[in-house]
């Protein structure tokens, strides 16, 4: 019996087609992805093949103005239109709190939404009961396929799930649910979830009875043969893991941003054992036409976005200096504003020991692309912010050793004076450079804001200590020459859309007046 699994993950609000790098589509003839194009391909496969499942491994939420405006209603609407069979919850589905998940998505989706390792307690338990499930038995042709869901247990540190959801260890939570499916004589089981490729592989290895793992969160690109675009494969598709009980378990993921549609064909024997698995992600490029009815629907929903981008978010009573002449040479107040917003966006999990789990931000000055003049009545709009942060990136959470941070700050000024983009703006950090010293030895003082303290204060950076830092995904991926971050980071979790982070902060503060205050000397 043959099953075709079509899968997406980490789509992050890319409802419209995008450029090759998943930013705003400029030249339509070279654009990719989007739900209208995805629908064309999905329908083509559904017509050609008998047993097809369309699955999403989480993080539909967060990433473009679509999510900012529609807050998840757009996800439910267009996933319903594409007739997804099931979705696993990702960490970003909790970005607007539990209510922001329940109302727009859980109550509106026509397909089951899954996670076995999220347990509700207190008053939320009855409110959310039945809106998401640990597993689903999906009838496909004359057979049934069990799907078990899972979500990153780090979600409380990455999003806003509140205090009434407990995120258990994925493997511990999945095993009893898989055992139940086996009891029901469901012998073909897919683990669908959002914990990253390393955890996906562990699930394949450790959870008895799981036949296939369809993952997300780490934006992993797998491919067999010559890759069709810029993404470099992290391994073959499917990636085969040998389980502890000796089975060959295919593990797949489909990069991110709706650029590819994962396509996996699995052949099962009559006892539900995987006989063979093969496939590849399908690049959704312009050779695949956009479905006209979905495209028309997208255009209808678009109207509200254009109106939103010119509305006032808040006011500034000072000039927001985002000029390259400032931000690539010295501390600039636009850099301070953005870093403050980045930290504010990550305020969660205070307890008796920690006032917050992260206090530090770094931001390449070259990523700040425009100032905002306060003389326009002080008004700040989404449009203004899109000029400051035009690349459609995210502000991510990483864990780094102090020694890596020190290298990053040395790199920040290794060729100072040439108006290069690597000069770092900061938050929760005081850095002193001596530019008379030779490159690689210019950081003379590097103090960082404590987190394990009731009164935050600046302490010298410790080389062997592990620190959490918020930074643009561009830096996490080694951009502007920050190879040491990419090579030495201990953990990387993707965060929220950059403009969204700053716009939310400005809306919250209402009036802003960021200063240059001696963070960089």
């Amino acid at each position: 019996w043959e099953l075709t699994i079509l899968h997406t993950n980490d789509v992050h609000s890319r409802l419209e087609q995008t450029s090759e790098d998943s930013s705003k589509c400029v030249n339509a003839s070279r654009c990719m992805g989007g739900v209208a194009r995805l629908f064309t391909k999905v329908q083509q496969i559904r017509r050609a093949e008998p047993n097809v499942l369309l699955l999403d491994a989480g993080d539909q939420y967060q990433g473009t103005i679509w999510f900012t405006v529609y807050k998840g209603a757009e996800v439910a609407h267009f996933m319903n239109a594409l007739r997804y069979d099931a979705m696993a919850l990702g960490n970003h589905e909790f970005d607007n709190g539990v209510e922001g998940l329940i109302e727009p998505l859980l109550k509106e989706a026509k397909f089951p939404i899954l996670s076995a390792n999220i347990k509700a307690k207190g008053p939320l338990a009855s409110q959310i009961s039945g809106l998401y499930l640990p597993y689903k038995v999906l009838p496909v042709g004359d057979e049934v396929v069990g799907i078990v869901g899972y979500t990153s247990k780090e979600t409380p540190f990455l999003s806003n799930p509140g205090t009434n959801l407990v995120f258990e260890d994925e493997i511990t939570a999945l095993q009893p649910e898989v055992d139940k499916l086996k009891t029901l004589n469901v012998n073909k089981i897919i683990a669908l979830g959002h914990s990253g490729f390393e955890t996906d592989k562990l699930i394949a290895q450790k959870v008895r009875g799981v036949d296939v793992v369809v993952g997300g969160h780490s934006n992993t690109f797998l491919y067999t043969g010559n890759p069709p675009s810029k993404e470099v494969p992290a391994g073959k598709y499917p990636f085969i893991v040998t389980s502890d009980d000796g089975r060959k378990v295919p593990v797949v993921q489909a990069y991110a941003f709706g650029k590819y549609l994962g396509y996996l064909k699995i052949e099962f024997d009559e006892r539900g054992n995987v006989i063979s698995s093969h496939g590849n992600p399908i690049l959704l490029n312009s050779s695949i036409p956009e479905d006209p009815s979905i495209k028309a629907d997208i255009n209808k929903w678009r109207i509200k976005l254009d109106n939103y981008s010119t509305q006032e978010l808040g006011k500034t009573i000072v000039y927001l200096d985002g000029s390259s002449q400032s931000c690539r040479f010295r501390e600039c107040n636009m850099g301070n504003l953005i870093c403050d917003a980045m930290i504010n966006n990550n305020l969660r999990h205070a307890d008796e020991m920690f006032w917050n789990h992260v206090s530090m931000c770094i931001l390449n000055g070259g990523g700040i692309r425009s100032p905002i003049d306060e003389r326009n009545n002080g008004t700040i709009t989404w449009e203004n912010l899109a000029a400051v942060l035009p690349f459609g990136g995210t502000f991510d959470l990483v864990q780094l050793k102090g020694s890596t941070l020190k290298k990053a700050f040395e790199h920040s000024v290794h060729r100072y004076g040439q108006s290069t983009g690597e000069f770092l703006q900061v938050g929760g950090i005081h850095v002193v450079y001596d530019l008379s010293r030779k490159p690689g030895d210019r950081v003379v003082k590097l103090d960082v804001l404590c987190t394990k303290c009731r009164v935050p204060s600046y302490d010298p950076l410790k080389m062997d200590e592990i620190y959490k830092v918020i930074l643009p995904n561009f830096l996490a991926n080694g951009g502007d020459g920050f190879q040491m971050i990419k090579d030495e980071l201990l953990r990387h979790d993707s965060g929220d859309q950059d403009i969204n982070v700053v716009s939310t902060y400005i809306s919250k503060m209402k009036v802003i007046y960021p200063a240059v205050e001696g963070r960089i000397k």
Epitope: K107, P112, V137, L138, P139, K180, T183, L184
Partner: antibody
Framework: QVQLQQSGAEVKKPGASVKVSCKAS????????IYWVRQRPGQGLEWIGW????????KYNEKFKGRATLTADTSASTAYMELSSLTSEDTAVYYC????????????WGQGTLVTVSS | DIQLTQSPSFLSASVGDRVTITCKAS??????VAWYQQKPGQSPKLLIY???TRHTGVPDRFSGSGSGTEFTLTISSLQPEDFATYYC?????????FGQGTKVEIK
């Protein structure tokens, strides 16, 4: 809250067919199986089959295969059970039901529809 | 088909009594067993699923146990509203089947 509202009682002649409806409310219809169970007068319960409104797949108890047809109208959030070639043995209360977790017990029941087959 | 045999078929008990109903399966069904309560003229109500998990809103005097072929439903202290017929059901193998029922009457 989850509710399943069934159509009213029916009296049918032997050899005829009957179609019982079950309107669901209080939840997303396409996300849960609808099960059909019958209970003959003074007897126990008998499972007829299920339909998954998400993709209209069905499963029948072999005893009813060929005579029972399960369908669903997602736009009306309504499931239907049609039973053909009726005999007096089919006189029973017919229930639709829904689960909490797939297959694992019928948590929500309709009020039942009495079908009487009599010449 | 898997046969489920409940015992006893009838049971007379008083308020406050501890009542145990057993359900034997003709072949193993692991823990894929549910228990229902039905009162005359009403639809059945789910009490227990997965052999021992109480359904939402079911009083904790009701408990289920067992696996494989032998299952029990226990009412720790019988209340006036508990007089009804109780059915077990297996959902491990098709066709899903029910026990013949146990009627709990007032002594």
């Amino acid at each position: 809250q989850v509710q399943l509202q069934q159509s009213g009682a029916e009296v049918k002649k032997p050899g005829a067919s009957v179609k019982v409806s079950c309107k669901a409310s209080g939840y997303t219809f396409t996300r849960y199986y609808i099960y059909w169970v019958r209970q003959r007068p003074g007897q126990g319960l008998e499972w007829i089959g299920w339909i998954y409104p998400g993709n209209f797949n069905t499963k029948y108890n072999e005893k009813f295969k060929g005579r029972a047809t399960l369908t669903a109208d997602t736009s009306a959030s309504t499931a239907y059970m049609e039973l053909s070639s009726l005999t007096s043995e089919d006189t029973a209360v017919y229930y639709c039901a829904r689960d909490v977790y797939d297959y694992a017990g019928f948590a929500y029941w309709g009020q039942g529809t009495l079908v009487t087959v009599s010449s | 088909d898997i046969q489920l045999t409940q015992s006893p078929s009838f049971l007379s008990a008083s308020v406050g009594d501890r009542v145990t109903i057993t359900c034997k399966a003709s072949q193993g069904v692991a823990t894929a067993v549910a228990w229902y309560q039905q009162k005359p003229g009403q639809s059945p109500k789910l009490l227990i699923y997965w052999a021992s998990t109480r359904h939402t809103g079911v009083p904790d005097r009701f408990s289920g146990s067992g696996s494989g072929t032998e299952f029990t439903l226990t009412i720790s202290s019988l209340q006036p509203e508990d007089f009804a017929t109780y059915y077990c059901q297996q959902y491990s193998s098709y066709p899903w089947t029910f026990g013949q029922g146990t009627k709990v009457e007032i002594k």
